[in-house]
């Protein structure tokens, strides 16, 4: 695991404890609530910040607010067990013993069961929709401007590979973004769309994860893009498990914020 | 050198508290983690928690998360554990190590605890 | 909780010989596994950090080996004062924890 050598700190995760006690004496940074060394080249999996998230003092909670977050069936918050490699689990389950199965990116995808609920893969989900609509301004922005904006941002602040962003689309004020990867596509060292957006919606609500970076200031040709509601859509690879009950009012996991 | 030194033997009545100190020397103290380890009599190593002394961010075995309290006074290179509502399973020799691979040990401190 | 096995409980040689302990893990944890030894009222000591990292001050007899889960502590030629007991421990994530113990002993 590398991390800035200078001064032991970890550029890409805020929520990290860093010290020079890694193997051949690196700096190591382990993510709160894991203790899981972190690769600070690249982005922390959202599942590892879910948990330091859940983990950091009442106190020390900087970046979230408990309430934030919620599925729209008000799951809200929880703290995730994550497998060896920081990815969320297949099985959930909260300490009352009520489980469930979820996606790559930790949104529930079926109906909450007991202890003997059975999941038996980690569906990945391999289209995100990041849907934002902006304040109003003196015009509409430039499409292609705004295209390429967003598009240097996932490849330049969050590392996503250009290939993943698969779209664009604007119609004022509302600004969509496709991410598209899918498990065949993703290769090692490869980010993961799930954590790419993770960062950029950290980072659309003024949290950034990134460390002593200032917050994102996203300009368009100058004009500032200030985002006054985000809505994310997770579409998986296999369609979700739910009742019908359940189907007949939500087509797609999403996530509300305002 | 790293040096790591602990308080005295204790003996303390069951539901009473302990603490126990760990002077470091030899290193920049805020910079590594300290661990607490205790081991029974006969018995084997069993880690407590762990403090960065940098932020005093704690973390603590579940098992002993609601009657062990880890502290660090920068001023003094000093780390601390305090133990409450001891019971007489809680006697064993309490170790302090540095960093994540436990580099440097302190030579231990028992504590007993007996009615 | 990574849970780690050592084995064998006891392990009964001579002086010379080459002794082998092992170490398994429940889950994968890279190379995150540091070795100890510790003599009758003495604190345990370091070592071998991250499964075969050498340690300053270590004799060169002391190696160690593997990852993922499954690793390996080896004495080449074993010296009187090596009759101990043997610890492994894990740093992949909290809580860290502790193999049971391998007793070293004189045959």
């Known amino acids: 695991h590398t991390a800035a050598q200078d001064n032991c700190t970890c550029p890409t995760n805020k929520m990290t404890v860093c010290s020079p006690d890694g193997p051949g004496g690196r700096c190591q940074c382990r993510a709160l609530g894991s203790g899981m060394a972190v690769d600070c080249s690249t982005l922390t999996s959202k599942c590892l910040l879910l948990k330091a998230r859940m983990s950091a003092p009442k106190n020390a909670r900087t970046l979230v607010r408990p309430s934030e977050h919620a599925l729209v069936d008000n799951d809200g918050l929880y703290d995730p067990d994550c497998d060896p490699e920081g990815r969320f689990k297949a099985r959930q389950c909260n300490q009352t013993s009520v489980c469930w199965c979820v996606n790559s990116v930790g949104v529930r995808r079926t109906d909450k069961g007991d202890l003997s609920l059975r999941c038996d893969e980690l569906v990945r989900t391999h289209h995100i929709l990041i849907d934002l609509r902006h304040r109003p301004t003196a015009g509409a922005f430039n499409h292609s401007d705004l295209d390429a904006e967003l598009r240097r941002l996932f490849r330049e602040r969050y590392r996503l590979h250009p290939k993943f962003v698969a779209a664009v689309h604007y119609e004022q004020p509302t600004i969509q973004i496709e991410l598209r990867q899918n498990t065949s596509q993703k290769a090692a060292g490869d980010v993961d769309i799930g954590d790419a957006a993770y960062y950029f919606e950290r980072d659309i609500k003024g949290e950034s994860l990134f460390q002593g970076r200032g917050g994102l200031d996203l300009r368009v040709r100058g004009e500032p893009l200030q985002v006054e509601r985000t809505l994310i859509y997770y579409l998986d690879e296999i369609p979700p498990k739910f009742s019908m009950k359940r189907l007949t009012h939500h087509h797609h996991h999403h996530h509300h914020h305002h | 050198q790293v040096q790591l030194v602990q308080s005295g033997a204790e003996v303390k009545k069951p539901g009473a508290s302990v603490k126990v100190s760990c002077k470091a020397s030899?290193?920049?103290?805020?910079?590594?983690?300290i661990h607490w380890v205790r081991q029974a009599p006969g018995q084997g190593l069993e880690w407590i928690g762990t403090?960065?002394?940098?932020?005093?961010?704690?973390v603590y075995n579940q098992k002993f998360r609601d009657r062990a309290t880890m502290t660090a006074d920068r001023s003094i290179s000093t780390a601390y554990i305090e133990l409450s509502r001891l019971r007489s399973d809680d006697t064993a020799v309490y170790y302090c190590?540095?960093?994540?691979?436990?580099?440097?040990w302190g030579q231990g401190t028992t504590v007993t605890v007996s009615s | 909780e990574i849970v780690l096995t050592q084995s064998p409980a006891t392990l009964s040689l001579s002086p010379g010989e080459r002794a082998t302990l092992s170490c398994r893990a429940s889950q994968n944890i890279g190379t995150s596994i540091h070795w100890f030894q510790q003599k009758p009222g003495g604190s345990p000591r370091l070592l071998i950090k991250y499964a075969s990292e050498s340690i300053s001050g270590i004799p060169s007899r002391f190696s160690g080996s593997g990852s993922g889960t499954d690793f390996t502590l080896t004495i080449s030629s074993l010296e009187p004062e090596d009759f101990a007991v043997y610890y492994c421990?894990?740093?992949?994530?909290?809580?860290?924890?502790f193999g049971q113990g391998t007793k070293l002993e004189i045959k």
């Open positions: 403090i960065f002394p940098s932020n005093a961010y704690a």
């Open positions: 030899g290193y920049t103290f805020t910079t590594h983690w």
């Open positions: 190590a540095r960093a994540s691979y436990f580099d440097y």
């Open positions: 421990q894990h740093s992949h994530s909290w809580p860290f924890t």
